[in-house]
Interface confidence: low
């Protein structure tokens, strides 16, 4: 093994590099002295550190490693920033396509419904953005706050026209009459299940990525224990102790020293792999009902056949609220 | 029969568009961005050697440095630690994490679980009760790839695609609803959001 | 120095509600987990519940689940028990305690303890 | 839950002397870690609890090195090597490695 080199006589090396970490402080001394007051750089013989200087090379050790986790970091913290974001707005689009063509459906087919229609669709659509965000909606509730909001329209302007216009009173027979008499046959639940399913599985995918965006900005911005500090230390800088300042640490060294660093960091690993594995499952099974886009997007249609279903029953329908509502319609006529 | 919201319908059932290839579309998109999040699966794992790689580490020198002085590359002292008597790496592994990855690690665990609740079995379209209460008509079957109607009158089949969405939009007619503050036509920015999402690396 | 303060504390009839509050002064109140401790007259200590640190999670003792809520409002450094459907057998001096979790030092190394290493002085 | 027993529950013991006592769990207390999530708490007649050991081993800070902690998995013991007049009061081991958390019923 060949003899280390003779240190530094005046120590000037060390301290031209110490003046670039720490201009104008005299922490370094002339030359060589015993050091028995260091803690990390621990001499051999004499040294050209101080505890002071192995302070600082402490905190700029830190610094390096810091700025070495986010470089790692940077390219996965973009993609799925950049993927979070994207399809945040193209789910939202998606939403507001929906609603446009529902809308489009009830002006086309049933003028005699808006703008009623619209201000329910509306709602509806509003309450699946705000699901998709994380909102604690019930999906349920807001199928049937649909149904139960156009069923007396439908009954007062399609299904029996002579009703005067201040039905209020028949509105709440009407709304409840919607769910104990089925006017909507299955068509409800139908929707219930394609939206809810639909929705969980797009709004846990949207909570997944954002999890994923902490998960790095966690790590990005770890702090390093004591120990990690002194070992960084010792392995990026107590060589310029000895005036070596060229030296590189050793590969395998290295490892070791990042391994016990990153110790903590590294316990993640086994989540991150199950995070990335459980979200692939996720997006395979991303198709049919548990697809927003392909669901959301056809809602139009359902809706339509929905009313297409009341007014093919309307005869028997009409009888049958006529003897339940009865008594809200002769308070009204009266 | 009903009157569709854009001329595409055909027979005013089925939604007939023709397949572009490499078209791209938000299932395609998120297929994408689990083959780049999979190429980022060994991360956490990965990273001790990644910083060692892109931090001043002996590569070509004969001589590196063990935290307690300069040793030939090859030598068993390289290999070494060098930090014998000094700290124990033992302990510093045995410390849990910080407390903040503690609880990151906890909200992963949490996620992967309701990830796998939430993934779907292969093969199903509707739930079972759904198909045994029955419709009037035309329940979805199985070999019905993209069936989300009820009833056989409104049956409608949608191509799960972006670029459809975005052209379909300039087809509806409700600009003018009243009480309709939503254009039909999407802003500008909108297309480009659907015809750009390749673009995010 | 690090302070816990609780108060709240008083006599009711059974059935009724009471809210304690407990306030933290000295430490980064938002970055700890927060429990609730008591001890009936002439007995021994009963862990009553804990809170996460951001208030996310939250585990209580048998005897008190259902009837107990913990919550904290980091924002003015408080921990609060809203005790309701209040027993004869919840009478006791209710301690809020920290959870020592790590520290920072001056050079802003972290180094781990654990342990409650705080309590407050109790209220009735 | 986890049940902590200790024993003896009352400990008379001349300034100067040793005193030990024991904490038994009915499950290992052994985290996959390899902590043993066990504390220890002193309350001095009519003041709040504190802490003296946790995980098993490791002294508070402040806490005079008198005391120390030892054991693991299931069986505990606190040891105070000399007892001074001012360590008067009640002794309580706590598991911390599961919810609920629970205490031994305490050693005078």
């Known amino acids: 093994q060949p003899p280390p080199p003779p240190p530094d006589a005046t120590c000037h090396q060390v301290r031209s590099f110490f003046q670039r970490l720490q201009p104008g402080l005299k922490w370094v001394p002339e030359t060589p002295v015993p050091g028995s007051d260091l803690q990390v750089c621990l001499p051999k013989g004499p040294t050209c550190c101080s505890r002071k200087m192995e302070e600082k090379y402490q905190l700029t050790a830190r610094l390096n490693m810091e700025q070495l986790l986010q470089s790692a970091s940077m390219e996965l913290k973009f993609l799925i920033i950049q993927n979070a974001a994207v399809f945040q707005e193209a789910f939202e689009i998606v939403v507001r396509h929906a609603k446009n063509y529902t809308n489009a459906m009830f002006k086309n087919n049933y003028p005699s419904l808006t703008p009623q229609a619209f201000e329910f669709v509306g709602e509806f659509f509003t309450d699946v953005s705000l699901y998709i965000l994380g909102s604690d909606i019930n999906v349920d509730d807001m199928v049937n706050e649909l149904f139960d909001s156009l069923f007396p329209v439908i009954y007062t302007q399609l299904m029996n026209p002579g009703l005067p216009d201040s039905a209020l009173d028949i509105n709440e027979c009407l709304r409840g009459a919607r769910r104990d008499l089925k006017v909507f046959g299955n068509f409800p639940k139908l929707i219930m299940t394609q939206v809810s399913k639909s929705l969980q599985v797009t709004r846990i995918f949207l909570q997944a990525l954002n999890l994923g965006i902490e998960v790095i900005n966690t790590t990005d911005h770890l702090k390093f224990s004591k120990d990690c500090g002194r070992m960084l230390t010792r392995m990026w800088y107590c060589s310029y102790c000895q005036g070596l300042m060229m030296v590189k640490p050793c590969g395998g060294y290295c490892n070791v020293v990042m391994q016990g660093c990153m110790a903590g960091v590294v316990e993640i690993d086994k989540y991150w792999r199950e995070y990335i594995l459980s979200l692939e499952e996720l997006v395979n099974g991303m198709y049919r009902i548990y697809d927003m886009e392909n669901v959301l997007l056809g809602l139009f249609s359902t809706i339509h056949d929905s009313i297409q279903y009341v007014q093919k029953n309307a005869g028997k329908l009409t009888t049958t609220i006529g003897k339940l509502c009865a008594h809200s319609q002769q308070r009204q006529y009266r | 029969s009903a009157y569709y919201p854009e001329d595409l319908f055909i027979d005013k059932k089925v939604l007939k568009v023709a397949h572009v290839e490499h078209e791209e579309t938000l299932s395609s998109r998120r297929r994408e961005l689990i083959q780049k999040l999979k190429s980022f699966i060994s991360f956490y794992s990965a990273l001790p050697g990644y910083i060692c790689s892109h931090s001043p580490v002996a590569e070509n020198d004969t001589l590196c440095w063990n935290g307690q002085e300069l040793v030939e590359r090859y030598s068993q002292k390289a290999a070494r630690n060098g930090m014998k008597n000094q700290f124990n790496l033992h302990e510093l592994k045995m410390k849990g994490p910080e407390p903040v990855v503690s609880q990151i690690i906890d909200k992963l665990k949490h996620i992967n679980q309701l990830l796998r609740t939430m993934s779907v079995p292969k093969g199903r379209v509707l739930d079972k009760n759904l198909d045994e209460e029955g419709f009037e008509s035309g329940d979805c079957g199985d070999d019905e790839d993209e069936c989300i109607g009820g009833s056989g009158d409104g049956m409608m089949k949608v191509k799960n695609q972006l670029r459809f969405l975005a052209e379909l939009a300039y087809d509806l007619d409700v600009d003018d609803v009243p009480g309709n503050n939503q254009q039909a036509t999407p802003k500008d920015n909108e297309i480009s959001t659907f015809h750009n999402l390749g673009n995010v690396h | 120095q690090v302070q816990l303060q609780e108060s709240g504390g008083g006599v009711v009839q059974p059935g009724r509600s009471l809210r304690l509050s407990c306030a933290a002064s000295?430490?980064?109140?938002?970055?700890?987990?927060m429990h609730w401790v008591r001890q009936a007259p002439g007995k021994g200590l009963e862990w009553v519940a804990v809170?996460?640190?951001?208030?996310?999670?939250?585990y209580y003792a048998d005897s008190v689940k259902g009837r107990f809520t913990i919550s904290r409002d980091n924002s003015k450094n408080t921990l609060y028990l809203q005790m309701n459907s209040l027993r004869a057998e919840d009478t006791a001096v209710y301690y809020c305690?920290?959870?020592?979790?790590?520290?920072?030092?001056?050079?802003?190394?972290?180094?781990?303890?654990?342990?409650?290493?705080?309590w407050g002085q109790g209220t009735t | 839950d986890v049940v902590m027993t200790q024993s003896p529950l009352s400990l008379p013991v001349t300034p100067g002397e040793p005193a030990s006592i024991s904490c038994r769990s009915s499950?290992?207390?052994?985290?996959?870690?390899?902590?043993?999530?066990l504390d220890w708490y002193v309350q001095k007649p009519g003041q709040s609890p504190q802490r003296l050991i946790y995980?098993?081993?490791i002294r508070a800070s402040g806490v005079p090195d008198r005391f120390s902690g030892s054991g693991s998995g299931t069986d505990f013991t606190l040891k105070i090597s000399r007892v001074e007049a001012d360590d008067v009061g009640v002794y309580y081991c706590?598991?911390?490695?599961?919810?609920?958390?629970?205490f031994g019923q305490g050693t005078k």
């Open positions: 305690a920290k959870e020592g979790t790590y520290y920072y030092d001056s050079s802003g190394y972290w180094d781990y303890y654990y342990g409650m290493d705080v």
């Open positions: 000295g430490f980064t109140f938002s970055s700890y987990a």
């Open positions: 809170i996460s640190y951001d208030g996310s999670n939250k």
């Open positions: 499950q290992s207390l052994l985290d996959s870690d390899g902590y043993n999530f």
């Open positions: 995980l098993g081993s």
């Open positions: 706590m598991q911390a490695l599961q919810t609920p958390w629970t």
